[in-house]
């Protein structure tokens, strides 16, 4: 086992049945938000499969936040009787592997990969940059790891940490950044400043992903790209918190090396994007 392998593996004490989430937001990490209040709230922990308490700061955060333990349980847990342990090989894959490729409605054409259930292989497609569905991967390897069967009929690798697109927005995820960090913010935070083609000189800010800071630039008033903010605060809020240290709190669970690796299987809620 290399260190890199372990970094991307979720290891748990016991064999758990596949986790089928009732709502995709139940997979979000607990997010206390940027504010400083101390409010007792509850979130669903996908690793322990239980609703747990956390301290919420009072603003922002995400949907995996509930006023009471009961509300959390109602939204994110199923009765054990209703938990169907999937056994067939086809069902080992996440549900989204069986969705048709969907380029989405936007026009920022990006090369992505999808699992083609007809050919049983991951294939390239052009993604428009927004919406679409979860059968959409940045790399061929990622697609193969999550959706293709290995030579012995089992999944090639675990996908327990593939939680960066758990809603149906499928906004562009990042290109790769230095190894200690992962970028989970909008992909345009990684693009260079672009003045655009007009003649105005508007004061704007862009996120410089090399130095990790928001910097001013002069915007021409039209065109350019999305890495363009009217204030430094806006820029920081959109891009700065996208950089997450892999070893920070809420990161990956690690225990002793020799335990059996367990994939955390997550079946996302249906998104209702159909091919006609």
């Amino acid at each position: 086992d290399s260190e890199e392998d372990e970094e991307h593996t979720i290891i748990t004490d016991t064999e758990l049945p596949p986790l089928k989430l009732m709502h995709s937001f139940c997979a979000f990490k607990a997010d206390d938000g940027p504010c400083k209040a101390i409010m007792k709230r509850f979130f669903f922990n996908i690793f322990t499969r239980q609703c747990e308490e956390f301290i919420y700061g009072g603003c922002e955060g995400n949907q995996n936040r509930f006023e009471s333990l009961e509300e959390c349980k109602k939204m994110c847990t199923r009765d054990n009787a209703n938990r169907i342990i999937k056994t067939t090989l086809q069902q080992e894959k996440p549900d989204f592997c069986f969705l048709e490729e969907d380029p989405g409605i936007c026009r920022g054409y990006i090369t992505r990969y999808f699992y083609n259930n007809q050919t049983k292989q991951c294939e390239r497609f052009k993604y428009g940059g927004c919406l679409g569905n979860m059968n959409n991967f940045e790399t061929l390897e990622e697609c193969k790891n999550i959706c293709e069967d290995g030579p012995n009929g089992f999944q090639v690798d675990n996908y327990g940490t593939q939680l960066n697109a758990v809603n149906n927005s499928l906004t562009p995820q990042s290109t790769k950044v230095p190894s200690l960090f992962e970028f989970h913010g909008p992909s345009w935070c990684l693009t260079p400043a672009d003045r655009g083609l007009c003649r105005a000189n508007e004061n704007r800010f862009y996120y410089n992903s090399v130095i990790g800071k928001c910097r001013p630039f002069k915007y021409s008033g039209c065109g350019g790209n999305e890495n363009n903010f009217t204030s430094k605060q806006e820029c920081l809020r959109a891009c700065k918190k996208g950089f997450i240290q892999r070893i920070s709190k809420g990161g990956l669970i690690k225990t002793k090396r020799k335990r059996k690796k367990q994939r955390v299987k997550i079946a996302y809620e249906e998104i209702f994007v159909k091919n006609m």
Epitope: F25, E60, N62, Q63, D102, P103, I105, C106, R107, G108, G128, G129, C130, L131, N167, N168, S169, T171, P172, G185, P186, W188, N225, E226, N228, F229, T230, E234, A238, I271, F272, V273, K274, N275, M276
Partner: antibody
Framework: QVQLQQSGPGLVKPSQTLSLTCAIS??????????WGWIRQSPGRGLEWLGL?????????AYAVSVKSRITINPDTSKNQFSLQLNSVTPEDTAVYYC??????????????WGQGTLVTVSS | DIQMTQSPSSLSASVGDRVTITCRAS??????LHWYQQKPGKAPKLLIY???TLQSGVPSRFSGSGSGTDFTLTISSLQPEDFATYYC?????????FGQGTKVEIK
Amino acid sequence: QVQLQQSGPGLVKPSQTLSLTCAISGDSVSSNSGGWGWIRQSPGRGLEWLGLIYYRSKWYNAYAVSVKSRITINPDTSKNQFSLQLNSVTPEDTAVYYCARYLGSNFYVYSDVWGQGTLVTVSS
Amino acid sequence: DIQMTQSPSSLSASVGDRVTITCRASQGISSYLHWYQQKPGKAPKLLIYGASTLQSGVPSRFSGSGSGTDFTLTISSLQPEDFATYYCQQQNGYPFTFGQGTKVEIK
């Protein structure tokens, strides 16, 4: 200049099918630059997105969960128009229905052109 | 679904006033937010897309800001033709959802 012209009946009986058409001028229903959709507005519900279609070498659609089992949006390339069908209507479906063009930029999609609106009343 | 909450639901202002309308999303939506203006009996009209980009032909007195969960539409100097209802709408994921609207009335 893109324009959308809506047509269809203003009165539909409960349990029947609501059918509206949106004729496009100045753009093509098969355009690769965006899509076409329907939104409705009622005093009780405000503005409610119903669904959209778009063409990217084949047709795709996305529907609101609230109407998913009852809705169909279809393109008609020969007439350069698209239609809304909403089955099994009830008085709660009474609203002003708008068709709209969804323009897709690099990362955004927004309704930049709207039809004039059609008040549809569901009543026996 | 992502809930969009606008405040205030209505406001009274005079010509020349600076008006600010806020929109809050129930979860982070980056800058996938658009603003529309609607006058009685008319279809909504796009003002701003992507939280801060002014739609072509819209006067520069309109501006938008924000990202994540909190967004603002500002009219720097209210004109007679600006008395209308304003809606925010998210595009972060299906279904697209709108705020309940903010009605700007003459004081």
